[in-house]
């Protein structure tokens, strides 16, 4: 539906508060280095302009597209060239090329200081002094560090952030109330950001068809009682929402997401029996709840898939008539029967089925050719099952920290060219699959584990894309979205890698390690482990384990010593010498 003024339309639909928050998110995700005050000024100017358009949609410039309005505003920033370098060249372009240019300059790993959490009393004072600024600052800091964060979901996080401060700043023990809530929001926020980053990568690197296939599989698992036509409608709408958000069209995205939630709640009966509670909540909670809703029960007595997709004499006819619709139906039918499979496995099966039909429907006897297609699925299903079984066994044996260390060694041997901070970050996240998924029964392990690994490996892919250093990473990241995890799993030691020169400084530790949090101390030790493997990629696990055990004992001993710094200096030298001897460095 055409509106005379797009900006007025979105302002009226979303309301002033959400409009301002979304414009701030959009600007912070584009200009990640700009100071908070500059962004607030730009947002206020845009908001005042939007209000003039609401009053009179025919007013000057009100007919311009949002990209034109926002792009023009961003291009007024005086320090654009000094701060962003070649991104300033985007401003010489016309829409839609200008927006595409801004999108290409989004930085997944911006050079920004780590967010340090102030004392609780300091935060509560800031919250009470100026609640609006305090919450805007939260949106700004998250958005600039996570330039693909799902904007309408960030509004939900901000609402929870506000609620936490409102409640806890009045509590007797403010810290005991607030800190766990902030930790939870931080962890959930990182997970939400990574999940959305995969959706955007899927759309931007592999196209709309790839995203739609993912959505068909996931929604069919979630809503197995819904008809194929209903699932297809939801997939189309969801694809539009995510295409908009990934493209920086945050106002449209939030508006369309609200419409989709409204539609789902109005049509619960034909979608899922699990939506009742979600649909009683306010908008932001409702949308979040729907996105996380548990799978509905499978309809009883679903017929065998073979009848329509293998035994029917019309398979090739149906496929030829509408290939993507037929494959979509196959994916829908397979996914609704298999909530125990990961989405990526379901997509691999659909791809195998498609490849078989492409080959067999051109053969002399198509039916004879594709009759055993389901037999080809067995190894594809067993591969992730075996991998999850093995890794959960190792996780249960080692616990999370040592399991992460095993993965650090594994991935450093596979792709030693990748930067140490990236290897540590990615391997630590890969290792979290254990605590997250291994506790589940068999039927829930694979969707939990493999779909989570897809999200984490996408982090590796987007970080590596910024500074490519490994052909093997590039290959696994770009060849096939659904085969990324099997591609990385299959990698053996990189025989072309020339071991890193030994540098004693890398393995020199100081007393400051003793005052670090447990997490920070782990990261220090894991950084040393990666560096060790980069120096000695042929070291066996037993050798590395012995060195790490000695290292842990060394840190523990020196942190208990009276003269910590002397202990680290003297014992550190001995440890390095012993490790060199043990590993033949």
């Amino acid at each position: 539906d055409a509106h005379k003024s797009e900006v007025a339309h979105r302002f009226k639909d979303l309301g002033e508060e959400n409009f301002k928050a979304l414009v701030l998110i959009a600007f912070a995700q584009y200009l990640q280095q700009c100071p908070f005050e500059d962004h607030v000024k730009l947002v206020n100017e845009v908001t005042e302009f939007a209000k003039t358009c609401v009053a009179d949609e025919s007013a000057e410039n009100c007919d311009k597209s949002l990209h034109t309005l926002f792009g023009d505003k961003l291009c007024t920033v005086a320090t654009l060239r000094e701060t962003y370098g070649e991104m300033a060249d985007c401003c010489a372009k016309q829409e839609p090329e200008r927006n595409e240019c801004f999108l290409q300059h989004k930085d997944d790993n911006p050079n920004l200081p780590r967010l340090v959490r102030p004392e609780v009393d300091v935060m509560c004072t800031a919250f009470h002094d100026n609640e609006e600024t305090f919450l805007k600052k939260y949106l700004y800091e998250i958005a600039r560090r996570h330039p693909y964060f799902y904007a309408p979901e960030l509004l939900f996080f901000a609402k929870r952030y506000k609620a936490a401060f409102t409640e806890c700043c009045q509590a007797a023990d403010k810290a005991a109330c607030l800190l766990p809530k902030l930790d939870e929001l931080r962890d959930e926020g990182k997970a939400s950001s990574a999940k959305q980053r995969l959706k955007c990568a899927s759309l931007q690197k592999f196209g709309e068809r790839a995203f739609k296939a993912w959505a068909v599989a996931r929604l069919s698992q979630r809503f197995p009682k819904a008809e194929f036509a209903e699932v297809s409608k939801l997939v189309t709408d969801l694809t539009k929402v995510h295409t908009e958000c990934c493209h920086g069209d945050l106002l449209e995205c939030a508006d369309d997401r609200a419409d989709l939630a409204k539609y789902i709640c109005e049509n619960q009966d034909s979608i899922s029996s699990k939506l009742k509670e979600c649909c009683e909540k306010p908008l932001l909670e409702k949308s979040h709840c729907i996105a996380e809703v548990e799978n509905d029960e499978m309809p009883a007595d679903l017929p065998s898939l073979a009848a329509d997709f293998v035994e029917s004499k019309d398979v090739c006819k149906n496929y030829a008539e509408a290939k993507d619709v037929f494959l979509g139906m196959f994916l829908y039918e397979y996914a609704r029967r298999h909530p125990d499979y990961s989405v990526v496995l379901l997509l691999r099966l659909a791809k195998t089925y498609e490849t078989t039909l492409e080959k067999c429907c051109a053969a002399a006897d198509p039916h004879e050719c594709y009759a055993k297609v389901f037999d080809e699925f067995k190894p594809l299903v067993e591969e992730p099952q075996n991998l999850i079984k093995q890794n959960c066994e190792l996780f249960e044996q080692l616990g999370e920290y040592k399991f992460q260390n095993a993965l650090l060694v594994r991935y450093t041997k596979k792709v030693p060219q990748v930067s140490t901070p990236t290897l540590v970050e990615v391997s630590r996240n890969l290792g979290k699959v254990g605590s997250k998924c291994c506790k589940h029964p068999e039927a829930k392990r694979m969707p939990c584990a493999e779909d989570y690994l897809s999200v984490v490996l996408n982090q590796l892919c987007v970080l590596h894309e910024k500074t490519p250093v490994s052909d093997r990473v590039t290959k696994c990241c770009t060849e096939s979205l659904v085969n990324r995890r099997p591609c990385f799993s299959a990698l053996e030691v990189d025989e072309t890698y020339v071991p890193k020169e030994f540098n004693a400084e890398t393995f020199t530790f100081h007393a400051d390690i003793c005052t670090l949090s447990e997490k920070e101390r782990q990261i220090k030790k894991q950084t040393a482990l990666v560096e060790l493997v980069k120096h000695k990629p042929k070291a066996t696990k037993e050798q590395l384990k012995a060195v790490m055990d000695d290292f842990a004992a060394f840190v523990e001993k020196c942190c208990k010593a009276d003269d910590k710094e002397t202990c680290f200096a003297e014992e550190g030298k001995k440890l390095v010498a012993a490790s060199q001897a043990a590993l033949g460095l």
Partner: nanobody
Framework: QVQLVESGGGLVQPGGSLRLSCAAS????????MGWFRQPPGKEREFVAS????????YYADSVKGRFTISRDNAKNTGYLQMSSLKPEDTAVYYC?????????????????WGRGTQVTVSS
Amino acid sequence: QVQLVESGGGLVQPGGSLRLSCAASGPIFSTYAMGWFRQPPGKEREFVASINRSGDSTYYADSVKGRFTISRDNAKNTGYLQMSSLKPEDTAVYYCAADSDGIGWFNSFEYDYWGRGTQVTVSS
């Protein structure tokens, strides 16, 4: 240090059988998983089969499933690979390996110790 010695290789006709053994000495064999890998002429080393430390989980490459059986006797510090319905494409040097995690991984770099290999030739 674990030492591994393979035996049982040889020349066999297509359709025939062979049983490979892997004798271990050194630390306690039952704490290690065992794997069999092979290297066909002019090709990369590839996974064949593995068995975890307790012997209750076994894994096979798709190409040998249903034809090969891996087993172990912890009392004898020995692992076995029973190969039947052999094909010319099974011709390779077969290596036994030990994994200190006790899991029985598919990747060769996960194994700490290796034998020197035994030649298996399938030809008429």
